[in-house]
């Protein structure tokens, strides 16, 4: 037989299919010009010493073969003895290692079988009603196609699906979308309405992320507040490594996950902007305020579930940094100014109450006064910190108040509102005999003691009503008891206690009159 013709003799090997897993597959045959045809196939398995034979059976029942040798592609003309206007059945037999391996058969009319291309170029992927929609430009001069897809996940084999007939300049396919695993898709096409026409090759892989982007495993650590009133937020991040199907490993466009950091500054609600979104790689500096931090993971289908953490406020207080003077017109605070043209946010809330009850006031940008101090004043009528109770005050500063990450903490401290000197007066001062010349003086803790750092000391005063001489004695703020000794029997004394702050002298308690009885010996 001539090599250019289909040989109508028995092939030069025994007729027996080994049924092995390897062998020829994916046979495609089509017209490539007015009178020339091509068949190509894949061979799976070791290729050494393998000989391929393209078999063809005509509708009359006569069969022939082409010897392709080790090649997996073969061309022939319409003069090679194969009928091109009528239906023929083709398959490949591969002779290897003393056994024959057969491909699946294709039955087709060769003249009408056009070589179809898989989707070429950009395949657009989108989500539609919980499904995946793929769309692509129809290859030139190939309108009218049947389209199939196959898809697999990292843990499952290929599954075949049908896209249905296509008859337009753009083609599309609806495919299943997985919630939590990445998928690899491939598409192939064949001529529509041409009975038995060959499928194109599979397209390049289309890698599709899961519908829900994986949440990052993130740990935050916050440094201590620095001298500049800022603390660095550090992200110890191990983004979840998305497991990818085989064809998507390496460079897998489409499966990328981006992580963003959303900061919400909870303190100082009167400022202009409370939230800011940053790239996860950018480590922001925060003030000592309380924040909620969300990590948002997104893929091409949009954002996934948020993970939110609460970063509590830094409650380190500076008891001496804030000077408060109370006058008839109102109250003024003074603190060391940060720099020129700073906006300050003064926030206060009653101690022991929910953070939602914080009140704040934003100052206009101000320069330091000649003493290097910044100030904030309010009138009694405003009612700010007007109740006689303990307030927690935080002052924040920013040269750019519209930028959330540029706020810094100036100071945090406690302040007793209202008329502190009167409200702090110790009550329930009691005098008890201790010995022949001494008494024990006790008092209930001042209301100021509920306000950390506010109560500087108690002062106990004892007055000798005979000589009118007075002694005063300071007592640490943690103590509420002292013993007076060296008292003389029969002399009247009065004792009073007051509570002082760093800025205010307290009001004396009501005088307690007492005397030690004269001991009459028998």
């Amino acid at each position: 037989c001539r090599t250019s013709e289909c040989c109508f003799q028995d092939p030069p090997y025994p007729d027996a299919d080994s049924g092995s897993a390897s062998g020829p597959r994916d046979l495609r045959c089509y017209r490539i010009s007015s009178d020339r045809y091509e068949c190509s196939w894949q061979y799976e398995g070791p290729t050494a010493g393998v000989s391929h034979f393209l078999r063809c059976c005509l509708s009359s029942g006569r069969c022939c073969y082409f010897a392709a040798g080790s090649a997996t592609r073969l061309q022939f003309s319409d003069q090679a003895g194969v009928s091109v206007l009528y239906t023929v059945t083709l398959w490949v037999e591969s002779w290897a290692r003393n056994q024959t391996e057969k491909s699946p058969e294709v039955t087709l009319q060769l003249y009408n079988s056009v070589k179809y291309e898989p989707p070429l170029g950009d395949i657009k992927v989108s989500k539609l009603a919980g499904q995946l929609r793929m769309e692509w430009e129809t290859p030139d001069n190939q309108v009218g196609a049947e389209v199939q897809f196959r898809h697999r996940t990292p843990s499952s084999p290929w599954k075949l699906g049908d896209c249905g007939p296509q008859d337009d300049d753009t083609e599309s396919c609806l495919c299943p979308l997985e919630m939590n695993v990445a998928q690899e898709f491939q598409l192939r096409r064949r001529q529509l309405g041409s009975q038995g026409s060959s499928w194109s090759k599979w397209s390049s892989p289309v890698c599709v992320p899961p519908e829900n982007p994986p949440q990052p495993q993130v740990r935050f650590s916050v440094e201590q507040l620095g001298q500049d009133g800022r603390r660095r937020l550090t992200l110890k991040e191990q983004p979840t490594q998305l497991e990818l199907p085989e064809g998507c490993q390496g460079l897998a466009p489409g499966t990328e996950v981006t992580y963003r950091l959303q900061l919400h500054m909870l303190s100082c609600p009167c400022k202009a902007k409370a939230t800011r979104t940053l790239h996860l790689g950018k480590m922001p500096y925060l003030s000592g305020a309380a924040y909620n931090v969300a990590v948002i993971s997104s893929n091409q289908f949009g954002p996934g579930l948020n993970q939110t953490w609460h970063i509590p406020a830094d409650t380190h207080t500076e008891p001496v940094a804030l000077n408060i003077s109370v006058g008839t017109n109102g109250t003024t605070m003074y603190w060391p100014a940060r720099a020129q043209s700073m906006t300050y946010c003064i926030e206060w809330q009653p101690v022991g109450q929910d953070g939602g009850l914080a009140t704040c006031s934003l100052t206009a940008p101000q320069d330091p006064d000649p003493a290097g101090m910044a100030t904030y004043s309010w009138s009694r009528e405003s009612g700010a910190m007007g109740q006689e109770k303990c307030y927690y005050i935080t002052i924040f500063a920013s040269a750019h108040p519209e930028k959330l990450t540029l706020w810094s903490t100036v100071l945090s401290t406690y302040h007793f509102g209202g008329n502190a000197s009167a409200a702090g007066t110790p009550h329930h001062v009691s005098v008890k005999n201790h010995s022949l010349d001494s008494v024990s003086v006790d008092w209930a803790p001042s209301l100021l003691s509920t306000c950390p750092g506010v109560l500087k000391e108690y002062v106990v005063r004892c007055r000798d009503e005979d000589s009118k001489q007075v002694s005063e004695h300071p007592v640490q703020p943690t103590e509420t008891q002292v013993t007076l000794s060296g008292l003389r029997a029969g002399v009247a004394y009065t004792v009073q206690v007051r509570a002082d702050t760093a800025w205010l002298r307290g009001v004396w308690s009501q005088p307690q009159r007492f005397s030690i009885e004269v001991q009459v010996s028998d």
Epitope: C462, D464, S467, V475, S485, G486
Partner: nanobody, 126 residues
Framework: QVQLVESGGGLVQAGASLRLSCAAS????????MGWFRQAPGKEREFVAA????????????NYKDAVRGRFTISRDNAKNTVYLQMSSLKPEDTAVYYC???????????????WGQGTQVTVSS
């Protein structure tokens, strides 16, 4: 500079009394607050009692550890430059080395002492 010397310690039965003395050198004794502290084996030094310096009406402000209040009395004699600790109803848990201290500090009632004596041993047996 103030030098302090304690005396009066010893071994006594539970329920007995002892009087500790602390003699101070220096002309400004009356302006110092004086205190007694104690240290039991394996424990930290703790405050026992203190007495203020002199006041215009010669009234002294004193303070006691709760566990000794009512049993111990601190007093001073500025003429003799001496401070005393009268201890009665002694208990085994009062066993310790007792130290005398002196301070010019504003708050003398529990700590912040500048000068210390060498200590005197008090042992209370049951």
């Amino acid at each position: 500079q103030v030098q302090l010397v304690e005396s009066g310690g010893g071994l006594v039965q539970a329920g007995a009394s002892l009087r500790l003395s602390c003699a101070a050198s220096g002309r400004t004794f009356s302006s110092y607050a004086m205190g007694w502290f104690r240290q039991a084996p394996g424990k930290e030094r703790e405050f026992v009692a203190a007495i203020s310096g002199g006041t215009p009406n010669n009234i002294y402000y004193t303070n006691y550890k709760d566990a000794v209040r009512g049993r111990f009395t601190i007093s001073r004699d500025n003429a003799k430059n001496t401070v005393y600790l009268q201890m009665s109803s002694l208990k085994p848990e009062d066993t310790a080395v007792y130290y005398c201290g002196a301070t010019m500090g504003r708050y003398w009632n529990t700590g912040g002492y500048d000068y210390w004596g060498q200590g005197t041993q008090v042992t209370v047996s049951s």
